[in-house]
Structures are given as C-alpha cells and as structure tokens.
C-alpha cells in the first residue's frame, strides 16, 4: 500500500533570464528510492539514479543543473519554460510517486518598463 506523500514547491513564478529551483520531497514512507526523474510535459530533463548519480538530458545540459539534493535548478529562463514540471520518484515496493510543479516565467520588470527609459 502506498503511504508516502510528495511535497513540492507548488506553483511558482520567476523572471525571464533568471533561475529557479524545483524541489520535491517524498515523506511518510519507508520505500527505497531507486531513481528520480524530472520531466517537463513529455520531455525528460534529468535523472538522478541511486547508483549512477545524475544524468542531464543533452538538450538541457546548458541550462539545467542538478541539485540541491534531489531537486533541479533551471537557469537562463525563457517564457517557453512556462508549464508543468513533474518529479517522479521510482521506489520499491511502493511504485511511482509523482509531484507536480507549475512554473510561470514572467517578462522581467526591466523589459516590461523598458519603454520609459528609452531616449527619444
């Protein structure tokens, strides 16, 4: 029987060009974690395998950093990074536990108000 729960950073927002930490925490279970996958919609961002350590998908390696812990740091954010992110804990004997985070990437305040500072 699955007894665990996943706590996540929930719905978060960040500025374009900045960085954000995605965090999940599995609690209330004695299940052993064998692997954690980080996915964005249908794309794999990274894997943290209990034996092999971290693997970052080649298409994200310039903008994704492992950690802290089992979390994931996204850098050089763009508006296209807005969307759902999933932390997928693979465990035995419980099975899969999934946490969902929604990230909204906002235009930076400088970009929003840039017109005021333009020289005519």
């Amino acid at each position: 029987m699955m007894t665990g729960t996943i706590e996540t950073t929930g719905n978060i927002s960040a500025e374009k060009g900045g960085s954000i930490i995605l965090q999940c925490h599995l609690s209330s279970t004695t299940a052993q974690v064998t692997q954690v996958n980080w996915e964005q919609q249908d794309q794999l961002l990274a894997i943290c395998n209990a034996d092999l350590g971290w693997h970052i998908s080649p298409s994200f390696k310039d903008r994704v950093a492992p950690g802290p812990g089992l979390g994931l740091t996204l850098q050089s954010l763009t508006v296209n990074d807005t969307g759902e992110y999933f932390c997928i804990y693979h465990t035995y004997p419980d099975g899969t536990y999934t946490g969902r985070i929604f990230l909204e990437v906002l235009e930076s305040s400088v970009a929003e108000h840039g017109a005021r500072f333009q020289i005519p």
């Epitope: 699955m2 064998t34 692997q35 996958n37 996915e39 794999l44 894997i47 395998n49 209990a50 034996d51 092999l52 693997h55 999933f86 997928i88 693979h90 035995y92 419980d94 099975g95 899969t96 536990y97 999934t98």
Partner: nanobody, 118 residues
Framework: EVQLVESGGGLVQAGGSLRLSCAAS????????MGWFRQAPGKEREFVGA????????YYADSVKGRFTISADNAKNTVYLQMNSLKPEDTAVYYC???????????WGQGTQVTVSS
C-alpha cells in the same frame, strides 16, 4: 500506461526451478523500474523483487533472497524472474509490474500462476 505480458508459469515440484518472463510494450525514459509481485490465495499481494533499468541494480524481498534472481534484456524490453529451490509456499499468482509514467503506483500485468507441489 505500459502494457505487460507475462509467461513461464506452471506446475513444478518442490526444489525445482521456473523462469518467468515479462515483456513491456514500450520503452520510454519514464520506464524506470520493473518488478515482480505475487499473491497467494487468501493473502495480500506482496513484493518479490525489482530491477532498475539504468543501473541494473536489483532488489529482493527477504523471503526470496538467494533463491530468486531478476535480470533484464534491454533490447527486448523484457525482464525475467529466475526462481530456484522453489517451495510450496511460493505457490501464487505472479504479477509483473512496471513504473512507466507519471501515474502513481505500478502498472500491472495479468499475472501467471505458479504452483509448487510437495
């Protein structure tokens, strides 16, 4: 959802061996661990063992350690459960299971009957 097809069950005498196979319909980055569970008549389904696709690390319940071995053939998307020194108490329906996506828990096969006679 991952579709799983088991084979290899049957009737065997105590002390004998059987090998169960489980083929997965898909092989995606989400398919992390595959495992085996069993359910004896009147009992709850129990964990037998599992294997992680990436590391090929294996994990076993204490009751089968040293007797059962899980292995994987990545090319065939198939996992195996080699069962040696079988005992009558190993009699159960054996289910293949996979962790294949964002849904919680396991995806399950239909199960295959293993009967160990004394």
């Amino acid at each position: 959802e991952v579709q799983l097809v088991e084979s290899g069950g049957g009737l065997v005498q105590a002390g004998g061996s059987l090998r169960l196979s489980c083929a997965a319909s898909v092989r995606t980055f989400s398919l992390s661990d595959m495992g085996w569970f069993r359910q004896a008549p009147g009992k709850e389904r129990e964990f037998v063992g599992a294997i992680n696709w990436l590391s090929e690390s294996t994990y076993y319940a204490d009751s089968v350690k040293g007797r059962f071995t899980i292995s994987a053939d990545n090319a065939k998307n198939t996992v195996y459960l080699q069962m040696n020194s079988l005992k009558p108490e190993d009699t159960a329906v054996y289910y293949c299971a996979a962790q294949g996506g964002v849904l919680s828990g396991w995806d399950w096969g239909q199960g295959t009957q293993v009967t160990v006679s004394s």
